[in-house]
């Protein structure tokens, strides 16, 4: 985790700062949303528990051609210890429900903000 944030700032950053950056990006996405995010693309809902970062990446990586979430995808890859490819579903998924990317981002943001407020950075 301490190696995160290289794309936003030089050198390693503390885990709290890395989580800050991800929250900031998700806030920006939700606040700057005018047209439907990613043209209303649907993604698998995930369990917001252990393995959440990899699960979130596995879900979002299947959305292509959506520049609004590219930075989020890169950030999540920094939180996930293994390489994630499109079509891969090895992490904890509730693979019975699909939701719009916009709702996915809102749900993820709420959960990450709670983790941040609790001081759970790892």
């Amino acid at each position: 985790l301490t190696c995160l944030g290289g794309f936003a700032s030089p050198g390693p950053v503390p885990p709290s700062t890395a989580l800050r950056e991800l929250i900031e990006e998700l806030v920006n996405i939700t606040q700057n949303q005018k047209a439907p995010l990613c043209n209303g693309s649907m993604v698998w809902s995930i369990n917001l528990t252990a393995g959440m970062y990899c699960a979130a990446l596995e879900s979002l990586i299947n959305v292509s051609g959506c520049s609004a979430i590219e930075k989020t995808q890169r950030m999540l890859s920094g939180f996930c210890p293994h390489k994630v490819s499109a079509g891969q579903f090895s992490s904890l998924h509730v693979r019975d429900t699909k939701i719009e990317v916009a709702q996915f981002v809102k749900d993820l943001l709420l959960h990450l903000k709670k983790l941040f407020r609790e001081g759970q950075f790892n």
Partner: antibody, heavy 123, light 107 residues
Framework: EVTLRESGPGLVKPTQTLTLTCTLY??????????VDWIRQPPGKGLEWLAH???????RYNPALKSRLTISKDTSKNQVVLKLTSVDPVDTATYYC???????????????WGQGTLVTVSS | DIQMTQSPSSLSASVGDRVTISCRAS??????LNWYQQKPGKAPKLLIF???MKPRGVPSRFSGSGSGTDYTLTISSLQPEDIATYYC?????????FGGGTKVEIK
């Protein structure tokens, strides 16, 4: 209008437990994104953050005082209570409560403050 | 914990002067820097948050700037009612920490 009002004992003896109450007006701690912080200021000195509590009962403490501090809320009374155990004369200070909001980015900026309550620790 | 260092600890300036107060953090705080004004015998008041954003009602002569570890509060034209102690506070992550304060007086 948003107002916060602290109340406390004024004088506490060393080793006793200090209990401070912050009553909230004009906003509710049951509302999403609302939080309340406690800050203290010894006479003639600077500000020291003690603890905060969020609407969903998430709590954080100053590590230097964590073992002695407990923060809690009573949503029905719209109050936040701070307890500081085993007080010492160095805990003599004006104790403030303040509101913080976590909408959007979490700024941890305290936008409304109470007037403060002076607590003296002496035998 | 993130340490906050303010300078100067006190200053004396004339009415109408431009006043600057500096605040340095022990690590990059990503613009999560807040400024408070505390008048004698009163509670602190939020003056600037997130480096440069102002709550409603704060006079335009107050402004904030900075990034990374270094931040500045500027009073463009000092007024008699600005006599106070000014504190910076990092809001990156708890434990929230304050600078030692800068006492501003009128010459």
């Amino acid at each position: 209008e948003v107002t916060l009002r602290e109340s406390g004992p004024g004088l506490v003896k060393p080793t006793q437990t200090l209990t401070l109450t912050c009553t909230l007006y004009g906003f509710s701690l049951s509302t999403s994104d609302m939080g309340v912080d406690w800050i203290r200021q010894p006479p003639g000195k600077g500000l020291e953050w003690l603890a905060h509590i969020w609407w969903d009962d998430v709590k954080r403490y100053n590590p230097a005082l964590k073992s002695r501090l407990t923060i809690s809320k009573d949503t029905s009374k719209n109050q936040v209570v701070l307890k500081l155990t085993s007080v010492d004369p160095v805990d003599t200070a004006t104790y403030y409560c303040a509101r913080t909001v976590s909408s959007g980015y979490i700024y941890y900026a305290m936008d409304y403050w109470g007037q403060g309550t002076l607590v003296t620790v002496s035998s | 914990d993130i340490q906050m260092t303010q300078s100067p600890s006190s200053l004396s300036a004339s009415v109408g002067d431009r006043v600057t107060i500096s605040c340095r953090a022990s690590q990059d705080i990503r613009n999560y820097l807040n400024w408070y004004q505390q008048k004698p015998g009163k509670a602190p008041k939020l003056l600037i948050f997130y480096t440069s954003m102002k709550p409603r009602g704060v006079p335009s002569r107050f402004s904030g700037s900075g990034s990374g570890t270094d931040y500045t509060l500027t009073i463009s034209s000092l007024q008699p009612e600005d006599i106070a102690t000014y504190y910076c506070q990092q809001g990156l992550t708890p434990p929230l920490t304050f600078g030692g304060g800068t006492k501003v007086e009128i010459k």
